[in-house]
Amino acid sequence: TPEVWVQVRMEATELSSFTIRCGFLGSGSISLVTVSWGGPNGAGGTTLAVLHPERGIRQWAPARQARWETQSSISLILEGSGASSPCANTTFCCKFASFPEGSWEACGSLPPSSDPGLSA
C-alpha cells in the first residue's frame, strides 16, 4: 500500500520560517501534489501549494518556494513574517494524487522540542 511521509522543520536561522518536505512511497506516477495547512485539504485546510509534474507549480502566501526534490517528493519553504505566518503547532498536510491508483495524504507538525527538527 502506498504511503506518504511528511517532515516539518523550523529554520535555525529564521525561527519563524518553516520547511515542509513530503514524499510518496509507492509505485504509481504522481499527477499532482497538494500542500495545505490547518488540516487536510478536504477538511478545512488551506492550500499553500499545488505541484504538477508537467504544468508547473502554483503557490500562495505565505509559501515562498515550492519545488520538486525528486519525481516523488517535494519541499516547500514558508515565509516567517506577517499575519499569515505559521506557528509552532501548525499542522501541514501533503496529498499525492496518482492516476489511476488514487490519492494518499499525511499530515505533520513541528516536533514538541523547541529545537528545529523533524516530524514524520
Epitope: 499527477s31 499532482l32 478536504g42 499545488v50 492516476f99 489511476p100 491508483e101 495524504e105
Partner: antibody, heavy 120, light 107 residues
Framework: EVQLVESGGGLVKPGGSLRLSCAAS????????MSWVRQAPGKGLELVSA????????YYLDTVKGRFTISRDIAKNSLYLQMNSLRAEDTAVYYC?????????????WGQGTLVTVSS | DIVMTQSPDSLAVSLGERATINCKAS??????VAWYQQKPGQPPKLLIY???HRFTGVPDRFSGSGSGTDFTLTISSLQAEDVAVYFC?????????FGQGTKLEIK
C-alpha cells in the same frame, strides 16, 4: 473547444469483438488521463478502463480484465478500447472521458457515447 | 471498493424551490468528490468538482458541500432545465465509483 467523438459501436454476437475509438481535439491529448465509462440501458455509470497520460499505468474493471484493452495513439489524438470475448452484460453506451488533474481527477469532458449491443 | 450511496433515488420539487441530493461514501474520500448531471439521451456533464467547486459555465444555483463521507448537491431554485439524473462520483481511490443516481423531476 474540447471535443471527444466515439465510434465503433454496434451489434455483435456473444464471444465477438469490437474496437471502440475516441477522436480527441481541442486540447493537448498527450497531457491528459483518459477513460472509458459505460452505462447499461436505464442503469448507472461504471468506469470500465482508464489510462494515465504516460500510457503506462492502466485500470480495468474486474469483469473486463483479460478481455478489454485500453490504448491510445498520440499521433492520431485517439483513444481506443479493444473489446474481446464480449458478453450480453457488456451491452451499454460507452463514453470516452477526459480526467482533469486539477479537479481531483473529475471527468470534465465526455463524448456523446457509442452503443454496444451484445446479442445473439 | 468505495461504495457511493445516493439519497433519495428520485425527487420531485416545485419550480423555484430548493432541491437537495445526498451522497454517502462507505469510507472517507477526502475532497475528491464530483457531481454530474445527465439529461435523457445525453452524456453526463460535470457540475461540481472537489466537493464544492463549480465547473466552467455551471449556474451558481448549483452548489456542493460536505467532507469525509457525507456530501450534498443543492440546487437553490429549481429551473425546468434542471430535470435530469444526478450522479456523485469519488476519484479518491481506485476503482473510481459512482452513486446509483438520483432522478430529479418537477412537482
Amino acid at each position: 473547444e474540447v471535443q471527444l467523438v466515439e465510434s465503433g459501436g454496434g451489434l455483435v454476437k456473444p464471444g465477438g469483438s469490437l474496437r471502440l475509438s475516441c477522436a480527441a481535439s481541442g486540447f493537448t491529448f498527450s497531457s491528459y488521463h483518459m477513460s472509458w465509462v459505460r452505462q447499461a440501458p436505464g442503469k448507472g455509470l461504471e468506469l470500465v478502463s482508464a489510462i494515465n497520460s504516460n500510457d503506462i499505468n492502466t485500470y480495468y474493471l474486474d469483469t473486463v480484465k483479460g478481455r478489454f484493452t485500453i490504448s491510445r495513439d498520440i499521433a492520431k489524438n485517439s483513444l481506443y478500447l479493444q473489446m474481446n470475448s464480449l458478453r450480453a452484460e457488456d451491452t451499454a453506451v460507452y463514453y470516452c472521458a477526459r480526467h482533469e488533474d486539477y479537479y481531483g481527477f473529475a471527468m470534465d469532458y465526455w463524448g456523446q457515447g457509442t452503443l454496444v449491443t451484445v446479442s445473439s | 471498493d468505495i461504495v457511493m450511496t445516493q439519497s433519495p433515488d428520485s425527487l420531485a420539487v416545485s419550480l423555484g424551490e430548493r432541491a437537495t441530493i445526498n451522497c454517502k461514501a462507505s469510507q472517507s474520500v477526502s475532497n475528491d468528490v464530483a457531481w454530474y448531471q445527465q439529461k435523457p439521451g445525453q452524456p453526463p456533464k460535470l457540475l461540481i468538482y472537489y466537493v464544492s467547486h463549480r465547473f466552467t459555465g455551471v449556474p451558481d444555483r448549483f452548489s456542493g458541500s460536505g467532507s469525509g463521507t457525507d456530501f450534498t448537491l443543492t440546487i437553490s431554485s429549481l429551473q425546468a432545465e434542471d430535470v435530469a439524473v444526478y450522479f456523485c462520483h469519488q476519484a479518491y481511490r481506485s476503482p473510481w465509483t459512482f452513486g446509483q443516481g438520483t432522478k430529479l423531476e418537477i412537482k
